[in-house]
Structures are given as structure tokens and as C-alpha cells.
């Protein structure tokens, strides 16, 4: 069998709402994946499990089942949404995200995704991790790849 390539493209949109009394931020983050099947037979994308972390705390999880079948030598773009909650333990974030004197309320989130594919009864898991900027101060739609967080401390490629 040839490889199945999973490429995390980035955040497509982030829709935000707030609970002022609970000092809680609700972010619905839609992400985009490209999955390429380099085989001469179809593969099934059985499930996608995703997790979002903020400051090493898991703030959201999602799981999609029986997603699609990708034909031979084909590629499919898949969107998946992770509902996230930045709760009161991080109530300082509520003030940051709602402060009108700040123009862009970008926070850095770690997106983790695992794609499980099956073919001929065989199962394969491919995982990706990526840091992304998300604006927690307003509803935002992104050009794909626009939200990527490039850590200046990373060694240059």
C-alpha cells in the first residue's frame, strides 16, 4: 500500500460567544484538512478525532465518524468543527478577549487531529499537531493558512 497523506491546512472560521456572568468564552473553531489517497484503491476515512489546547489545557474535543470514502489517487478536503470553552479558571482571558481597546484579540491554540482510515479491513492512524492564531474577540473567517502561528523560537528550516 502507498501512503495516505493528511495535511492540516488551518482554521477556516472561528465563531465566538461570551457568558459575562460566568466569565466564559465559547469558540466554535472550524478547521480544514486535506486527505490524499495515493493508492490505486479506495480508502474510507473512518473517523477524525480532534483536540484543541490553550496554554497546555484541553479546551475542546470533537469526533466525527464515517466521514467519507476517498477514491484511488484522489484528494478530499474535509472541514471539522471543535466547540471549545475557555472557562473561568482562565477568567483573565475573558477580559483580554472582550476588551474593546484591543483591536485584534489573537490567542495561540494548539490543534491536534488524528485521522483513522481503513482499507481492506486494515486500519491506519495519522496525527498532526499545529499551533494556530485564533481571534477570540470577534467572529472571523480566515483565508486558508492565514491563521498559522510561526514560533520565532523554532529553528529555521
Amino acid at each position: 500500500p502507498r501512503s495516505i497523506d493528511v495535511k492540516y491546512i488551518g482554521v477556516k472560521s472561528a465563531y465566538v460567544s461570551y457568558d459575562v456572568q460566568k466569565r466564559t468564552i465559547y469558540l466554535n473553531i472550524t478547521n480544514t484538512l486535506n486527505i490524499t489517497n495515493n493508492n490505486y484503491y479506495s480508502v474510507e476515512v473512518e473517523n477524525i478525532t480532534a483536540q484543541v489546547q490553550f496554554s497546555k489545557t484541553v479546551i475542546g474535543k470533537a469526533r466525527l465518524n464515517n466521514i467519507t470514502i476517498i477514491g484511488p489517487l484522489d484528494m478530499k478536503q474535509i472541514d471539522y468543527t471543535v466547540p471549545t470553552v475557555i472557562a473561568e479558571e482562565m477568567s483573565y482571558m475573558y477580559d483580554f478577549c472582550t476588551l474593546i481597546s484591543i483591536k485584534v484579540h489573537n490567542i495561540v491554540l494548539m490543534m491536534q487531529v488524528t485521522v483513522t482510515t481503513t482499507y481492506f479491513g486494515h486500519s491506519e492512524q495519522i496525527s498532526q499537531e499545529r499551533y494556530q492564531y485564533v481571534d477570540c474577540g470577534r467572529n472571523t473567517t480566515y483565508q486558508l493558512g492565514q491563521s498559522e502561528y510561526l514560533n520565532v523560537l523554532q529553528p529555521q528550516q
Epitope: 457568558d19 459575562v20 466569565r23 477568567s91 483573565y92 475573558y94 477580559d95 472582550t98 476588551l99
Partner: antibody
Framework: QVTLKESGPGILQPSQTLSLTCSFS??????????VSWIRKPSGKGLEWLAH???????RYNLFLKSRLTVSKDTSSNQVFLMITSVDTTDTATYYC????????????WGQGTSLTVSS | QIILTQSPAIMSASLGEEITLTCSAS?????VHWYQQKSGASPKLLIY???NLASGVPSRFSGSGSGTFYSLTISSVEAEDAADYYC????????FGGGTKLEMK
């Protein structure tokens, strides 16, 4: 119109448990975003926030008193309750319940208060 | 826990005088609210969100501030303004300031 009214025992002995009731009208605590807090004022001192209950039964407590406090509600009878265990003389105060309106973080309506004296 | 420190603890004012009460936060917060409590009465909302006047509050009251420093100003004090004034924050672990007692000279 919105009204809140507190009721309590008036006098307790040290180590007893205080039970307070806040009866309200003019709003529903099942409405999304609503909340009710308990606040007290010891004579000659400032206001001290104690506990808050949200429309969805979520709760918050004063960090320093958390182990002694229990807040609860009965939505159908429009009542909020506060229990304080092991009272002592420092709990002598006027106790208020106050409403926090829908998606607000300030108290727009207050009860008249109920006085508690802890004495042996 | 955020500590709100109000000063002065007691203030004496003459009728018609402009006075300012201050509220200092131990950490930066987005805004504060102010309550007035007259003797023997319940607290009453005066100003919310640092500078917004609550319904029915006379325009001689105003609020300002940001970060760690907030203030309440009464432009021309009247006899009925004699009361305790409290600032309040709901940002991090909900606290009230210690209060300022306003007395008439």
C-alpha cells in the same frame, strides 16, 4: 417589577447552621444568563460577596468561605437558599440577596436584607 | 483574588463641593461597578461598567478609570448623598472594595 426578600432565623448560637431564603418575583431564574448572589455586611464593615447561583444551577463561592457555604435554588417557587455551617460571632451581619440580570455582571436589584446575630 | 482598595475610608464634604472617591485594584481589570448604601437601607446600583449611570441616578454622579485605577466623582454634593460607597469587580473572584463613608460637614 423585580423584588427580592430575604428571610432567616435572626439569632443563632455558635456552631449552628444558618439557613437563609431569598424569595423573589418579577423574573425567572430559569432564564438563560440570570443569576442571584448572596452578599453580607457585618456592622461597621464593608460588603462581602459570598456565593452566586446561575440559571443553569452552576455555582460560585467565596474562596475563603467555600468549605462552609452551600447555595441552591428552587426555580418553580422562585427561591434561592444559602446554608452556612458552623457559624461564629464573625458571621453576625446583615445578609442580602441580589439579582444579576441577564448577561450582566452587576447587581441591579437587591433585597432589603435580613439580620443575623450569632451569640451564645 | 483581586483586592479593591478604596480611599479615603471616610470623607467629609460640604454641600455643593466636588469630590472624588477612588478604587484601586491589585491587578488590572476591565471595569468596576459602584454601589451606594444609605444608612439602614440596601445597596443600590449607581454606576456600572466604570462610567455608565444606572437608571434614575442623578447626573452629578460620574465614573471613570481603567486598568487598576477607578474613580467616582460627585460634581456637586447634596445632603442626600451621605452614604457608604462601594466599588465592585466581577472579573476575577468577585470582590467589593472596603467602602468609603461620605459624611456632610
Amino acid at each position: 417589577q423585580v423584588t427580592l426578600k430575604e428571610s432567616g432565623p435572626g439569632i443563632l448560637q455558635p456552631s449552628q447552621t444558618l439557613s437563609l431564603t431569598c424569595s423573589f418575583s418579577g423574573f425567572s431564574l430559569s432564564t438563560s444568563g440570570m443569576g442571584v448572589s448572596w452578599i453580607r455586611k457585618p456592622s461597621g464593615k464593608g460588603l462581602e460577596w459570598l456565593a452566586h447561583i446561575f440559571w443553569d444551577d452552576d455555582k460560585r463561592y467565596n474562596l475563603f468561605l467555600k468549605s462552609r457555604l452551600t447555595v441552591s435554588k428552587d426555580t418553580s417557587s422562585n427561591q434561592v437558599f444559602l446554608m452556612i455551617t458552623s457559624v461564629d460571632t464573625t458571621d453576625t451581619a446583615t445578609y442580602y440577596c441580589a439579582r444579576m440580570g441577564r448577561q450582566r455582571d452587576y447587581f441591579d436589584y437587591w433585597g432589603q436584607g435580613t439580620s443575623l446575630t450569632v451569640s451564645s | 483574588q483581586i483586592i479593591l482598595t478604596q480611599s479615603p475610608a471616610i470623607m467629609s464634604a460640604s454641600l455643593g463641593e466636588e469630590i472624588t472617591l477612588t478604587c484601586s485594584a491589585s491587578l488590572s481589570i476591565s471595569y468596576v461597578h459602584w454601589y451606594q448604601q444609605k444608612s439602614g437601607a440596601s445597596p443600590k446600583l449607581l454606576i456600572y461598567g466604570t462610567s455608565n449611570l444606572a437608571s434614575g441616578v442623578p447626573s452629578r454622579f460620574s465614573g471613570s478609570g481603567s486598568g487598576t485605577f477607578y474613580s467616582l466623582t460627585i460634581s456637586s454634593v447634596e445632603a442626600e448623598d451621605a452614604a457608604d460607597y462601594y466599588c465592585h469587580q466581577w472579573s476575577i473572584y468577585r470582590t467589593f472594595g472596603g467602602g468609603t463613608k461620605l459624611e456632610m460637614k
